[in-house]
Interface confidence: low
């Protein structure tokens, strides 16, 4: 049978010739008489034998890491017979490992994020190495690792390469490290070959700063003029923090302010002064507001860093604008009675300049040729008034500021005018009466009715009666409905159309006024040839006629 | 005629306490917010403290917050400023001043009280 | 806050003469906000100029201001005897600060 050890041959050996071990035949007695035959992949390159011993030589450097082992196969040949003494074999010739590579960090870049203030021990990233020597062989290919760079923030296990955070970091201080880990073989024995990996770990922002105002004091300005919602200026504090953990609102603290509000611009993260009121200089000409802000978002186990909120106070100074005159009452209403005299009194207005400068006032009457004013805002009649004509003015007065004639203010003033008796009541319309030639004594020839111009203080009431003349010798007589109406009658029987065809009759009307007014009304009575039914005939001829402005004989 | 006038200033140990007063006259002290304005050899003038026109609002520089506290009396047109705690680095000339309607700079001071702390 | 600082410290110069005196502020003075004082020894400060180049009540037209953003000055056209004393430049913007303070002495 065949005969030999395990055959090792070490890497990378410079020699030209490497004796790895002899294979034989156990039926070699020595005389020369064997033949050793050497095949497979590597024979005759990398590896010779000698034919007549059986010693392997290496012929080449090795290098385990591109191949740690070669399968061959052996042949033993009895060279006086030519036949095989030993059935062909296999057989194993492995390279044995020396420590010729270093760590190798196959991952980088190593980049990592980790919250900062985190706690010591945080997990921050695992690094692993690389070593092409045999894992089995020795420590060739044990690591260990080791931070070169990034004390006293860091540190690595040593045998994991695991990364932790020894010690507390700020972003605001500082935003990403970088890390040198070292991975050693031979477990940092002497000889050992080393590698280097820098690891990036960059911060990530926790919200642990509050924001806090630029300025401890700022100071606006507001116009008297300005609308509500008007934007009056912008305050800002600043946040360390970057991202969601900067967003803040603004607010105003213990809500001091019914005149302002703050609202908040979360592109710019400024506040913005609004004004919720309008502001009278002259009533108060400066504000004082304290602003608090705190960020939007505050996670509970960050809360100690928000305990109590940054204020800000804000001093808001009301710009005086001209104002325009003031009237004291938004309209007003006089009364005067009728038929007064020219120049009399009206009633007085009265404007101010609101204005801390409190500029004269002057007045003036809008197209009104009945009124006048003065300077003191007094209004007289410039014509003697009449009721019936009209019965009320509606003026526009005008106040201008004397020392600037832009300033202007007007309001409505209405004149109303009282009534007088001063207008007898009179026939509410024309009347043309007729009576008829056989009319008998007591028949009833008109209705009439009354108005009188004057207004009535409660109720007119009117008084009929015919003419001194004409209740003496009178055809007709009248009576008094005392209801504001008359009716006339006939005071006799029969009427001659020849001889009397029409009847002149005064009627007197007097009014309840104080003094009673009266007039002397014409009532016109025609006598009108009837038959006996009643009805009219050479009556209504000529009424036509008298319409139409014929005259009949 | 127009003026302030100062008084309390002394020579006060450390942690002890002082209160000015400065009273006013010659103008309507009722309508205008009053300060106190500190002068140091080594740190010059130095704005101290606010009051509104009417009491409303106070407002102190950082370095005397919660230490000071300033107040007024308008019927009696007089301002004051109570001092605790005080420190050797408050030793200085407190003038009061007035603010002007307008603006914010001062138009009318005092002629000022000498505050020195020492042990 | 807004720091102020005043050059020259000190300036020599005769009756008569023109004084120029700085104040630069560390950031923009918003709408001019800025006020000269004058002192004299023993006495309280004096407005001068507010607004940056308004001129107080009183105060004579050889005092003049100018000036806006970070750069202001103060000028004297012509000094007089009683005008020898510290000057002081102050914002009113932002709180109130004060610059160190110029003197104006007789050469």
């Known amino acids: 049978g065949w005969v030999w050890n395990q055959f090792f041959v070490p890497e990378e050996m410079n020699t030209t010739s490497h004796h790895v071990g002899r294979l034989r035949s156990d039926l070699d007695n020595g005389n020369n008489s064997f033949q050793y035959k050497l095949l497979g992949a590597g024979a005759g390159s990398t590896f010779i034998i000698d034919e007549r011993t059986g010693d392997i030589y290496a012929i080449e450097k090795l290098d385990r890491e591109e191949r740690s082992l070669y399968i061959l196969r052996a042949q033993v040949i009895d060279i006086t017979t030519g036949r095989a003494v030993e059935p062909e074999s296999e057989f194993v010739i492995k390279v044995s490992d020396i420590n010729d590579n270093e760590p190798k960090f196959l991952d980088e870049p190593y980049e990592a994020i980790v919250p900062e203030m985190s706690p010591e021990g945080t997990l921050v990233i695992q690094v692993t190495a690389s070593d092409a020597d045999d894992p089995s062989s020795g420590n060739n290919a044990r690591l260990l690792y080791s931070l070169l760079q990034g004390q006293p923030y860091f540190s690595v296990e040593p045998t994991t390469g695991v990364i932790r955070i020894s010690s507390k970091m700020d972003r605001e201080l500082q935003d990403e490290y970088w890390v040198i880990i070292q991975a050693k073989d031979m477990i940092g024995q002497p000889g050992a070959l080393s590698g280097t990996t820098s690891v990036l770990i960059k911060l990530s922002d926790v919200n642990d700063n509050k924001p806090i105002f630029k300025e401890s004091l700022y100071r606006l300005t507001v116009s008297e003029s300005a609308p509500t919602g008007t934007s009056i200026g912008t305050i800002m504090a600043y946040d360390n923090d970057i991202g969601e953990n900067a967003e803040m609102d603004y607010s105003i603290e213990e809500d001091d302010s019914q005149t302002f509000d703050i609202i908040t611009n979360h592109e710019t993260q400024e506040g913005i002064v609004i004004l919720k009121k309008k502001v009278n200089f002259e009533h108060q000409n400066h504000y004082g507001i304290r602003a608090k802000v705190k960020n939007h978002h505050v996670d509970e186990q960050l809360m100690k860093y928000h305990t109590e909120a940054s204020t800000t106070f804000i001093k808001i100074q009301v710009e005086d604008v001209d104002e325009p005159p003031l009237f004291l009452l938004p309209y007003y209403i006089f009364e005067i009675f009728e038929e007064t005299p020219q120049g009399s009194f009206v009633g007085v207005v009265s404007a101010t300049d609101p204005d801390n400068r409190k500029s004269p006032i002057r007045y003036s009457i809008t197209r009104s040729k009945v009124f006048n004013i003065d300077d003191n805002g007094t209004i007289t009649t410039t014509n003697s008034l009449d009721r019936e004509i009209s019965a009320w003015y509606n003026l526009s007065i005008t106040a201008t500021e004397k020392y600037n004639i832009e300033q202007i203010s007007s309001i409505p003033v209405y004149v109303q005018v009282l009534n007088i008796n001063d207008h007898a009541p009179e026939f509410s319309q024309y009347y043309e009466s007729y009576v008829c030639e056989n009319a008998g004594s007591g028949q009833v020839i008109q209705t009439i009715s009354a108005v009188d111009r004057d207004e009535s203080i409660e109720e007119h009431h009117f008084y009929f009666n015919l003419s001194v003349e004409d209740t003496n010798s009178s055809s007709f007589t009248i009576i008094d409905n005392q209801d504001n109406t008359a009716v006339i009658l006939t005071n006799r029987t029969g009427f001659n159309l020849q001889e009397e065809p029409i009847f002149y009759i005064s009627i007197l009307i007097a009014d309840n006024g104080i003094p009673s007014l009266t007039s002397t009304n014409t009532l016109t009575i025609h006598v009108c040839d009837c038959d006996d039914s009643g009805s009219t005939q050479t009556c209504q001829y000529q009424e036509l006629m008298l319409s139409m402005g014929f005259k009949t004989e | 005629q127009v003026q302030l006038v100062e008084s309390g200033g002394g020579v006060v140990q450390p942690g002890r306490s002082l209160r000015l007063s400065c009273a006013a006259s010659?103008?309507?002290?009722?309508?205008?917010?009053m300060d106190w304005v500190r002068q140091t050899p080594g740190k010059g003038l130095e704005w101290v403290a606010v009051i509104w026109y009417d009491g409303s609002n106070k407002y102190y520089a950082d370095s005397v917050r919660g230490r000071f506290t300033i107040s007024r009396d308008n019927s009696k047109n007089t301002l004051f400023l109570q001092m605790n705690s005080l420190r050797v680095e408050d030793t200085a000339v407190y003038y009061c001043?007035?603010?002007?309607?307008?603006?914010?700079?001062?138009?009318?001071w005092g002629r000022g009280t000498l505050v020195t702390v020492s042990s | 806050e807004i720091v102020l600082t005043q050059s020259p410290g000190t300036l020599s110069l005769s009756p008569g003469e023109r004084a120029t005196l700085s104040c630069r502020a560390s950031q923009s003075v918003s709408s001019s906000y800025l006020a000269w004082y004058q002192q004299k020894p023993g006495q309280a400060p004096r407005l001068l100029i507010y607004?940056?180049?308004s001129r107080a009540t009183g105060i004579p037209d050889r005092f003049s201001g100018s000036g806006s953003g970070t750069d202001f000055t103060l000028t004297i056209s012509r000094l007089e005897p009683e005008d020898f004393a510290v000057y002081y430049c102050?914002?009113?913007?932002?709180?109130?600060?004060f610059g160190q303070g110029t003197k104006v002495e007789i050469k």
């Open positions: 010659g103008f309507s002290f009722s309508s205008y917010d």
């Open positions: 102050q914002q009113y913007g932002s709180s109130w600060t």
């Open positions: 607004g940056a180049s």
């Open positions: 001043a007035r603010e002007t309607g307008e603006g914010w700079y001062f138009d009318l």
